[in-house]
C-alpha cells in the first residue's frame, strides 16, 4: 500500500478541530506582482513581507510595493509601507537582513534618474520605525553587514566605488575606487579586488587583492594577477593566472592573506573553473572543473592547511561556472554530503559520502519501491536524488533535498529509482538516518518542510491546479493526516516557515483570483495543540549514527569518533518545543586507515582502503611550495582526515622537512606585498 | 521594452475558424490578465473575452460566447484567441491589451497594434 | 450586462474651448472600475482615466474624470490639437466588460 495508508497508521485525535482553530487567513489589499518574505532574529516572530508589483515601461517604470509586518510568526500582518514614506522598494537588493539578533532591516529604494545617489530606510527595532538615508552613490549591491559588528555595513556603488558605514548607513566613506568584489573576513576585515586599467572585465587575471582590517585607513596588498577570490571556513582562495599561458592556479591562506601557498590542484585553462562547494574550519570541497564543455570536473578535499588535496570524485556534475551543482551538505548528520555524478553514457546519478569525501557510493534503494525503466537489472538498482539542476531543467521537481542540524538523520528529497536520475514525475523519499537507507514517503511531487525538530514534517502537492490541503506526519514520515485549510481553493506560491525547523507554525502562501484581479494571501497554521504536550524523556530513545554492523566494535565510527544520539521516538506525539537542543554522546575510536586520507602524490584504487603511489610521481622527491619555501615531503602515503579525532591504532610516518629553499608561485612573497595607509 | 504582439488574423470563409496568438515581452505575463477587444472598421471598440493571470478564470461577451476560447501559455508569454464558426460580423481588428492595473499611485494598460480578422466568401 | 451610454455621438469645437463628455450606465458601476480611453485613426485606443477619475501614467492634467454611480464626465479644459480623436468610457468592474458607443471631438 502507499506510504500513509497502512492499517497500522494512527490518527492524531481531533485534529481538524485544534488545526482550525490554529489556522489564521490573512488577505493581502495587494496587486499580485511578486512578494518577498523575510525573518527577522530569531524567536522573535517578526516577518516582513515585501509585495512588489513592477512593470518597465519604455520611459519611466511604474509599479508599487508595500510592507507588512507581523510580530505573531505570521498570523497576523499590518501594513508598514506608510513607514517607508509608500517608496517603491527594489526587489533585486532584497531586504538586507542583519546577523543574529541584532534587528537590523536595509530595505532600498528606488530613485528616480537624475539623483545623486541612492536611498534607503534602515531600522534596528525589528522593522518597527524605519528612518530614510539618501545615499552619497547609487549602490551596485545589497548592503553586506559585518558578521562581528551589525552596524558596520559595506557596499560597493555602480561606478565601482567600495562604500564603508561605521553608524548602520547613517554616515558612508568611499574608501576605494575601482573595485570589483568586496567580502567581509573575520574581525571586521574586508578584502577586495581592484582593477587598474579600466574595468573588472577587462582586467580579469590582473587584478588586485587588497586588505583592510581597520575599515579603509589603511590597506595592504595581499595577491596581484588574481583572477578571483572566495572564502570558506577559515581559508582564504585566490586563483591567480599563471606566468606564462592564460591558466590560474588555486592560492590559499590561513593568515588572512599575509602568507600564501599554492594548492596541489591542477590548474584551469580560461573556460574552466574552480568552485568551493563547502568549506568549514577543518577543509574544504573544492571542485575542479574539466578541460572543454563537458559539465563536469573533479571534486577534491583538502587537508586542514587547504593545501594538499586528495581526488574525491571523478565526473562531478557541475555545468558551468555559476551554473548547477547538486552538491548538498547533509546537515542532520555529520560527515554526509550527496551529489550527482554524470555517467559515460551521459545519464546522471546520485553519489553519497558518510566520511566527509573519503569515499561515496551509490544511495541504497528504497525497500518500498521497484526499479523504474532506467534500470537494467529490475532487482538491483539505487535511488537517485533531484537536486538544483533537475530544478534548472525545469523537471516537476517543486523543491530541493531538505535537512536540518536539530532534526537529527532526517533527509526529505525528491527522487526516482532505478540506474540513473529519471525524467518521469518524481516521487518524494525520506531517511531518517541520514542518508544510509530510504523509504518512499509521499507519491508525486510536494513542497515539505520540517517543523519542531522534525517532530513534524508538513508537505503540500506540486499542482497547476489551486489547492486548499496540507498533508502533515508526526512519525517522520511513515504516516500522513490530511486537513483542508480554506474552503476557497488558492494558487499556492510556497511554504515559508522559521528558519531553523523550531517553529510549530508554517505559513502556506499563494494568490486568490476574483474577476480579473488577484490578491496575495497567507494562511498560517500553528500546530501546537497537536503535539499538545511537551516531550519527556520517556519520548526519546538512544540512537548510534552511522551504524552499520552492531556486531562490530568500531560500528558507528566516522572521522575518528563516534556519537549517540537521544531521538524523538516515532510513536511519541509532543513537544520538541523552541528550546530543544540535540542531545549527543560522543566517543573517541582507534585509528585505522580510514581515517586518513592519501597523501599528495597517493591515491586509492577502488574498493581499496591502502593508498598506493601515483605511477607518474614514483621515485621522484616529494615537494611542493609551502609558504613560499620549498618543502620536501617524507610519507608512506597517508595523512589524517581534517576534523578526524581518533586516537590510537593504525599511525603512519609523516614528516615534512624544510628545504630551505625559497619558491614562488607567481604571487607575491611576503617581502614584496606592500601596505599604505589612507 | 514592454510589448504585445498580435499575429494569426487573415481572410476566412464563415463558419471556418483562425487562432489568433499574442506574444508578450518586457513584463512578468503571468501576473496580467488579459483581454481580446475587437474593433469592426468604422466601429466603436467591442471587449470579446478576458481570462485571469493564472488562466483559472476565462470571461466572454454572449456574442462569441461557445464560439472563441481564450487561453494563455504563462511558460511561453503568450495569449490565445481560438475562433470557430467565424461570422462575417466577426470581421474587425482584434487587440490584445492587458486588463486594467491599478496601484496605490498609478494606472496602465498596454495594447497590441492589432490583427485584422476578414470573414468573407 | 452593463450597458454605457456616451454623449454626444459627436463634439466639434475649437482648440484652446472646454470638452464635457458624458457617459451614462444601465446600472450603477463601483467607481473603482470606470475608464475612459483615447483613440486617433489607425492606433490602438490610449488609456487616459481609471478609477472614473484618476490619470493615467503620462497624461496631461488638462484631463480630469468624475462621477459616480451611474453617470460620469471626462473634461478636457482646454482642447490642444492633438486632443481631436474619439474617445470611449469602459467599466471594467465586471464580466462582461462593456465600451460605451464612443464621442468624436472634431475641430470645428
Known amino acids: 500500500s502507499a506510504p500513509g495508508e497502512d492499517e497500522e497508521c494512527g490518527r492524531v485525535r481531533d485534529f481538524v478541530a485544534k488545526l482550525a482553530n490554529n489556522t489564521h487567513q490573512h488577505v493581502f489589499d495587494d496587486l499580485r506582482g511578486s512578494v518577498s518574505l523575510s525573518w527577522v532574529g530569531d524567536s522573535t516572530g517578526v516577518i516582513l513581507v515585501l509585495t512588489t508589483f513592477h512593470v518597465p515601461l519604455v520611459i519611466m517604470t511604474f509599479g508599487q510595493s508595500k510592507l507588512y509586518r507581523s510580530e505573531d510568526y505570521g498570523k497576523n500582518f499590518k501594513d508598514i509601507t506608510d513607514l517607508i514614506n509608500n517608496t517603491f522598494i527594489r526587489t533585486e537588493f532584497g531586504m538586507a537582513i542583519g546577523p543574529e539578533n541584532s534587528g537590523k532591516v536595509v530595505l532600498t529604494a528606488e530613485v528616480s534618474g537624475g539623483s545623486r545617489g541612492g536611498r534607503i530606510f534602515r531600522s534596528s527595532d525589528f522593522a518597527k520605525n524605519f528612518v530614510q538615508t539618501d545615499l552619497p552613490f547609487h549602490p551596485l549591491t545589497q548592503m553586506m553587514y559585518s558578521p562581528q559588528n551589525s552596524d558596520y555595513l559595506l557596499a560597493l556603488s555602480t561606478e565601482n566605488g567600495l562604500w564603508v558605514s561605521k553608524n548602520f548607513g547613517g554616515k558612508w566613506e568611499e574608501i576605494h575606487k575601482a573595485v570589483c568584489l568586496a567580502k567581509w573576513g573575520s574581525d571586521n576585515t574586508i578584502f577586495f579586488t581592484t582593477y587598474a586599467n579600466g574595468s573588472c572585465k577587462a582586467d580579469l587575471g590582473a587584478l588586485e587583492l587588497w586588505r583592510t582590517s581597520d575599515l579603509g585607513k589603511s590597506f595592504k596588498t595581499i595577491g596581484v594577477k588574481i583572477y578571483s577570490f572566495g572564502l570558506g571556513g577559515r581559508f582564504l582562495f585566490a586563483s591567480v593566472m599563471a606566468d606564462k599561458d592564460t591558466t590560474r592556479r588555486i592560492h590559499v591562506s590561513t593568515d588572512q592573506g599575509d602568507t600564501w601557498s599554492m594548492a596541489q590542484l591542477p590548474s584551469v585553462g580560461q573556460e574552466q573553473f574552480y568552485s568551493i562547494l563547502a568549506a568549514n574550519d577543518d577543509m574544504v570541497f573544492m571542485h575542479v572543473d574539466e578541460p572543454g564543455d563537458t559539465g563536469f570536473g573533479t571534486i577534491f578535499t583538502s587537508d586542514d592547511r587547504g593545501i594538499v588535496y586528495s581526488k574525491s570524485l571523478d565526473r562531478h556534475l557541475y555545468t558551468t561556472t555559476g551554473g548547477e551543482t547538486d552538491f548538498t551538505n547533509v546537515t542532520s548528520l555529520r560527515g554526509v554530503y550527496i551529489t550527482s555524478v554524470l555517467s559515460e553514457d551521459n545519464s546522471i546519478q546520485t553519489m553519497i559520502t558518510f566520511d566527509q569525501g573519503g569515499r561515496w557510493t551509490h544511495l541504497r534503494k528504497p525497500e518500498n519501491s521497484e526499479c523504474d525503466a532506467t534500470a537494467k537489472n529490475k532487482n538491483e538498482c539505487s535511488l537517485h536524488i533531484h537536486a538544483s539542476y533537475s530544478i534548472s531543467q525545469k523537471l516537476n521537481v517543486p523543491m530541493a533535498p531538505l535537512s536540518e542540524p536539530n532534526a537529527v538523520g532526517i533527509v526529505i528529497a525528491h527522487g526516482s529509482v532505478g540506474d540513473a536520475i529519471s525524467v518521469m514525475v518524481p516521487d518524494v523519499y525520506i531517511s531518517d538516518d541520514g542518508g544510509y537507507s530510504w523509504t518512499k514517503m509521499l507519491e508525486g511531487p510536494h513542497y515539505y518542510t520540517i517543523l519542531d525538530s522534525g517532530g513534524i514534517i508538513v508537505a503540500i502537492e506540486h499542482s497547476s491546479r489551486p489547492i486548499n490541503v496540507i498533508k502533515f506526519s508526526t512519525d517522520e514520515g511513515q504516516c500522513w493526516q490530511t486537513y483542508t485549510f480554506t474552503r476557497d481553493p488558492i494558487y499556492f506560491t510556497g511554504l515559508a516557515s522559521e528558519p531553523g525547523a523550531r517553529s510549530m507554525n508554517i505559513s502556506i502562501w499563494g494568490f486568490t483570483e476574483s474577476f480579473l484581479t488577484s490578491q496575495w494571501v497567507s494562511y498560517t497554521i500553528d500546530f501546537k495543540d497537536i503535539l499538545e504536550r511537551n516531550c519527556e524523556e520517556k519520548d526519546y530513545t538512544i540512537w548510534l549514527a552511522h551504524s552499520t554492523d552492531p556486531e562490530d566494535y568500531e560500528d558507528g565510527c566516522i572521522l575518528g569518533y563516534k556519537e549517540q544520539f537521544l531521538r524523538l521516538r516515532k510513536s511519541s506525539v509532543c513537544q520538541n518545543g523552541r528550546d530543544y537542543v540535540v542531545t549527543k554522546q560522543p566517543s573517541i575510536c582507534l585509528c585505522s586507515l580510514e581515517d586518513f586520507l592519501c597523501d599528495f602524490g597517493y591515491y586509492r584504487p577502488e574498493n581499496d582502503s591502502k593508498c598506493v603511489e601515483q605511477p607518474e610521481l614514483k621515485g621522484h622527491d616529494l615537494e611542493f611550495c609551502l609558504y613560499g619555501r620549498e618543502e620536501h615531503l617524507t610519507t608512506n602515503g597517508y595523512r589524517k582526515i581534517p576534523g578526524d579525532k581518533c586516537q590510537g591504532g593504525v599511525n603512519p610516518v609523516r614528516e615534512v622537512k624544510d628545504l630551505k629553499k625559497k619558491c614562488t608561485s607567481n604571487f607575491l612573497s611576503p617581502e614584496k606585498q606592500n601596505s599604505k595607509s589612507n | 521594452e514592454v510589448q504585445l504582439l498580435e499575429s494569426g488574423g487573415g481572410l476566412v470563409q464563415p463558419g471556418g475558424s483562425l487562432r489568433l496568438s499574442c506574444a508578450a515581452s518586457?513584463?512578468?505575463?503571468?501576473?496580467?490578465?488579459m483581454s481580446w477587444v475587437r474593433q469592426a472598421p468604422g466601429k466603436g471598440l467591442e471587449w470579446v473575452s478576458a481570462?485571469?493571470?493564472?488562466?483559472?478564470?476565462?470571461y466572454y461577451a454572449d456574442s462569441v460566447k461557445g464560439r472563441f476560447t481564450i487561453s494563455r501559455d504563462n511558460s511561453k508569454n503568450t495569449l490565445y484567441l481560438q475562433m470557430n464558426s467565424l461570422r462575417a460580423e466577426d470581421t474587425a481588428v482584434y487587440y490584445c491589451?492587458?486588463?486594467?492595473?491599478?496601484?496605490?499611485?498609478?494606472?496602465?494598460?498596454?495594447w497590441g497594434q492589432g490583427t485584422m480578422v476578414t470573414v468573407s466568401s | 450586462e452593463i450597458v454605457l451610454t456616451q454623449s454626444p455621438g459627436t463634439l466639434s469645437l475649437s482648440p484652446g474651448e472646454r470638452a464635457t463628455l458624458s457617459c451614462r450606465a444601465s446600472?450603477?458601476?463601483?467607481?473603482?472600475?470606470l475608464a475612459w480611453y483615447q483613440q486617433k485613426p489607425g492606433q490602438a485606443p490610449r488609456l487616459l482615466i481609471y478609477?472614473?477619475?484618476s490619470r493615467a501614467t503620462g497624461i496631461p492634467d488638462r484631463f480630469s474624470g468624475s462621477g459616480s454611480g451611474t453617470d460620469f464626465t471626462l473634461t478636457i479644459s482646454r482642447l490642444e490639437p492633438e486632443d481631436f480623436a474619439v474617445y470611449y468610457c469602459?467599466?471594467?468592474?465586471?464580466?462582461?466588460?462593456?465600451f460605451g458607443g464612443g464621442t468624436k471631438v472634431e475641430i470645428k
Open positions: 491589451a492587458t486588463y486594467i492595473v491599478a496601484t496605490i499611485a498609478d494606472a496602465f494598460d498596454i
Open positions: 518586457g513584463f512578468t505575463f503571468s501576473t496580467f490578465a
Open positions: 481570462i485571469s493571470g493564472s488562466g483559472g478564470g476565462t
Open positions: 446600472q450603477s458601476v463601483s467607481s473603482s472600475y
Open positions: 478609477g472614473a477619475s
Open positions: 469602459q467599466q471594467y468592474g465586471s464580466s462582461p466588460l462593456t
